[in-house]
C-alpha cells in the first residue's frame, strides 16, 4: 500500500474533489406502452443537469420534456427503453446518476410467465406437448449488470425452453446484431443460450436483446450494458459523507466515509486541532491530528467508520476522512456539534456548515 504518514502538526493542502460515479446498480423504471413516465434526477445541489440515453445526449422533443431535475416521457414506446443518466455539473465537481427505463408489455417480455425452476428445460421435441418459448428461470432474468470495466468480457444468457426447441437471435439497440458491428465480433453458444463479447470497449455500451422464438410464440429480454473506462485516479469519496453530526455530552457519534479507488487506498481519519491557541500554522495550513489509520489488522470496512464514544465538548470540531493512493489524495470533512446534556445551562456556539 502506498503510505501517507500524517502525524500531529502536519498540514493538509486541499485538492480538487473528484468526479463521482454511481457504484451500485441503477434503479429500473417500468412503463407500459402509451403511458407517461416522470423521473427525478436524484442528485443534490445540481447547478446544471445534462441527460443522456444509452450514452447519447438527450434533448427535449415533442415527447421528451426536460424541466430542471425532472425528465418526462409522454406516450412511452419500447424505443424509449434504455440506460439513462443525468449528470450534475457543479463548480467543484460533477456527479452522474444512472437509471433504466423499460417500456414493455409484460406478456411479451416473458418475465412474468408462471414458470417452474427448470424442470421442463428439456421437453422432448417429438412429444405432443407443444409449448411456446418460456424462460427457465425468471428470477435470474431480473438481474442486470450496471457496468463492466473496459477490457473485460461480458456474457449475456437467456436460457429458455419450449417445444419445438426455440431458436435464439440477438439485437443491439433494437437492430440485428452482426459480427461486423464490433471489432473482434462476438461468440454465441446456442446450447448454453449465451453470447460473449471479449475485451469490451465503450462503444459496446447499449441494449442487448435476446429474441427466443418458435412457431408458437416469441419472448425477448433486454440487458443494459454500460462499459466503464478505468483510468488511474486518486480515490473517489462518496458525496455527502462524512455527514455533519450533533450529539449531547456523553453521547456517541459515528462518521462514515465511503472510498472508491483503483489503486489500493490508505485511509485516515483526522481531527483539526489547535496548537498554542491557533488552528493554523504560520503557513496558513491547519494543524491536524491522526485519530485512526488503516493498520495490519484493520479491514477496509472498519476504517471507513470513525466512532467517538462518550463525547465531550473538546470533541466538537472538524473531522476529515482522507484517502490517498499512488496517484493522489482526496478528502471530505464534516463537523461535530456537541450540545450540553439536558438540564445543563451551558450553551455551545453553532458550528460552521459542511465543508468539503
Amino acid at each position: 500500500r502506498p503510505s501517507f504518514s500524517l502525524v500531529e502538526d502536519t498540514t493538509l493542502e486541499p485538492e480538487e474533489p473528484p468526479t463521482k460515479y454511481q457504484i451500485s446498480q441503477p434503479e429500473v423504471y417500468v412503463a407500459a406502452p402509451g403511458e407517461s413516465l416522470e423521473v427525478r434526477c436524484l442528485l443534490k445541489d445540481a447547478a446544471v443537469i445534462s441527460w443522456t440515453k444509452d450514452g447519447v445526449h438527450l434533448g427535449p422533443n415533442n415527447r421528451t420534456v426536460l424541466i430542471g431535475e425532472y425528465l418526462q416521457i409522454k406516450g412511452a414506446t419500447p424505443r424509449d427503453s434504455g440506460l439513462y443518466a443525468c449528470t450534475a455539473s457543479r463548480t467543484v465537481d460533477s456527479e452522474t446518476w444512472y437509471f433504466m427505463v423499460n417500456v414493455t408489455d409484460a406478456i411479451s417480455s416473458g418475465d412474468d410467465e408462471d414458470d417452474t425452476d427448470g424442470a421442463e428445460d428439456f421437453v422432448s421435441e417429438n412429444s405432443n406437448n407443444k409449448r411456446a418459448p418460456y424462460w427457465t428461470n425468471t428470477e435470474k432474468m431480473e438481474k442486470r449488470l450496471h457496468a463492466v470495466p473496459a477490457a473485460n468480457t461480458v456474457k449475456f444468457r437467456c436460457p429458455a425452453g419450449g417445444n419445438p426447441m426455440p431458436t435464439m437471435r440477438w439485437l443491439k439497440n433494437g437492430k440485428e446484431f452482426k459480427q461486423e458491428h464490433r471489432i473482434g465480433g462476438y461468440k454465441v453458444r446456442n446450447q448454453h443460450w449465451s453470447l460473449i463479447m471479449e475485451s469490451v470497449v465503450p462503444s459496446d455500451k447499449g441494449n442487448y436483446t435476446c429474441v427466443v422464438e418458435n412457431e408458437y410464440g416469441s419472448i425477448n429480454h433486454t440487458y443494459h450494458l454500460d462499459v466503464v473506462e478505468r483510468s488511474p485516479h486518486r480515490p473517489i469519496l462518496q458525496a455527502g459523507l462524512p455527514a455533519n453530526a450533533s450529539t449531547v455530552v456523553g453521547g456517541d457519534v459515528e462518521f462514515v466515509c465511503k472510498v472508491y479507488s483503483d489503486a489500493q487506498p490508505h485511509i485516515q481519519w483526522i481531527k483539526h486541532v489547535e496548537k498554542n491557541g491557533s488552528k493554523y500554522g504560520p503557513d496558513g495550513l491547519p494543524y491536524l491530528k491522526v485519530l485512526k489509520a488503516a493498520g495490519v489488522n484493520t479491514t477496509d470496512k472498519e476504517i471507513e467508520v470513525l466512532y467517538i464514544r462518550n463525547v465531550t465538548f473538546e470533541d466538537a470540531g472538524e473531522y476529515t476522512c482522507l484517502a490517498g493512493n499512488s496517484i493522489g489524495i482526496s478528502f471530505h470533512s464534516a463537523w461535530l456539534t456537541v450540545l450540553p446534556a439536558p438540564g445543563r445551562e451551558k450553551e455551545i456556539t453553532a458550528s460552521p456548515d459542511y465543508l468539503e
Epitope: P149, N152, V154, K155, Q191, Y223, R230
Partner: antibody, heavy 127, light 107 residues
Framework: EVQLVESGGGLVQPGGSLRLSCAAS????????ISWVRQAPGKGLEWVGR????????NYADSVKGRFTISADTSKNTAYLQMNSLRAEDTAVYYC????????????????????WGQGTLVTVSS | DIQMTQSPSSLSASVGDRVTITCRAS??????LAWYKQKPGKAPKLLIY???FLYSGVPSRFSGSGSGTDFTLTISSLQPEDFATYYC?????????FGQGTKVEIK
C-alpha cells in the same frame, strides 16, 4: 504485446519472508487483475490469490491467508506477493497471471480467467 | 472447497488421434470452467473458458463442452505440440481450484 515478468524468488529459511514482483506491460493495468498461482515440484497448479486492479480488492486461498499479501502499484504497473511466515510446503514455482473477469449478466458472479502468464520464479523454503 | 477431478490422470496417444479428457466438479459450477495446457518447465496457457469458448489464437481442434458438474476437453486430431499436461479450473466458487492434471504422452 502483453508481458508479465516475475522476480524476487530464491532460497529462504522457514519462518522467513520474501516479496515477489510481477512487472506487467502491454495492457491497461487497472482494467483487469493479477492472480498468483504456484506449482510445487512435480505437482499440479494451486491458486494462491488474486487482486482486482480496478478496486484493489483481494482474495486468498485458505492455505496462505494471513501470511501472504497481494498488492499493486499502479504507477509502476507492478503487482506484489508479500510472503511471510514461510513454510517448507510453500516451496514452489510462483506464477503471476493477468486475470480478467467474465461478467455474467444472468447470474450474480464473475468468472475469472487467467489469459497471460509470467515465466515463473522459484521459491525454496528450507533450512 | 470445490474439488475438481480429472480423468484419466495420464494417457498415451498418437498424432492424429482424437483425445477426450473429462473433469468433474464436486458441486455445480454452472459453465464457469477453464482449460489450460502446460508443457514441462513452461507456464500454463489458456485454451478454453466458460466451458466451451475457445480462447483467441487457440487452434480449432480444441473444443470444450459441459455444464454443471461434468465437463469435457476434446482434441479432434492430436498434433505433436499437443503433448503436454492439461488442467481444468473452476472459478465460480472460492477459492478457485484446479484439477490434478491429465498428462498426454506419445504412444
Amino acid at each position: 504485446e502483453v508481458q508479465l515478468v516475475e522476480s524476487g524468488g530464491g532460497l529462504v529459511q522457514p519462518g522467513g519472508s520474501l516479496r515477489l514482483s510481477c512487472a506487467a506491460s502491454g495492457f491497461t493495468f487497472t482494467s483487469t487483475g493479477i492472480s498468483w498461482v504456484r506449482q510445487a515440484p512435480g505437482k499440479g497448479l494451486e491458486w494462491v490469490g488474486r487482486t482486482h486492479l480496478g478496486d484493489g480488492s483481494t482474495n486468498y486461498a485458505d492455505s496462505v491467508k494471513g501470511r501472504f499479501t497481494i498488492s499493486a502499484d499502479t504507477s509502476k504497473n507492478t503487482a506484489y506477493l508479500q510472503m511471510n511466515s514461510l513454510r517448507a510446503e510453500d516451496t514452489a514455482v510462483y506464477y503471476c497471471a493477468r486475470t480478467y473477469g467474465i461478467y455474467d449478466l444472468y447470474v450474480d458472479y464473475t468468472e475469472y480467467v487467467m489469459d497471460y502468464w509470467g515465466q515463473g520464479t522459484l521459491v525454496t523454503v528450507s533450512s | 472447497d470445490i474439488q475438481m477431478t480429472q480423468s484419466p490422470s495420464s494417457l498415451s496417444a498418437s498424432v492424429g488421434d482424437r483425445v477426450t479428457i473429462t473433469c468433474r466438479a464436486s458441486q455445480d459450477v454452472d459453465t464457469s470452467l477453464a482449460w489450460y495446457k502446460q508443457k514441462p518447465g513452461k507456464a500454463p496457457k489458456l485454451l478454453i473458458y466458460s466451458a466451451s469458448f475457445l480462447y483467441s489464437g487457440v487452434p480449432s481442434r480444441f473444443s470444450g463442452s459441459g455444464s454443471g458438474t461434468d465437463f469435457t476437453l476434446t482434441i479432434s486430431s492430436l498434433q505433436p505440440e499437443d503433448f503436454a499436461t492439461y488442467y481444468c479450473q473452476q472459478s465460480t466458487g472460492h477459492p478457485q481450484t484446479f484439477g490434478q492434471g491429465t498428462k498426454v504422452e506419445i504412444k
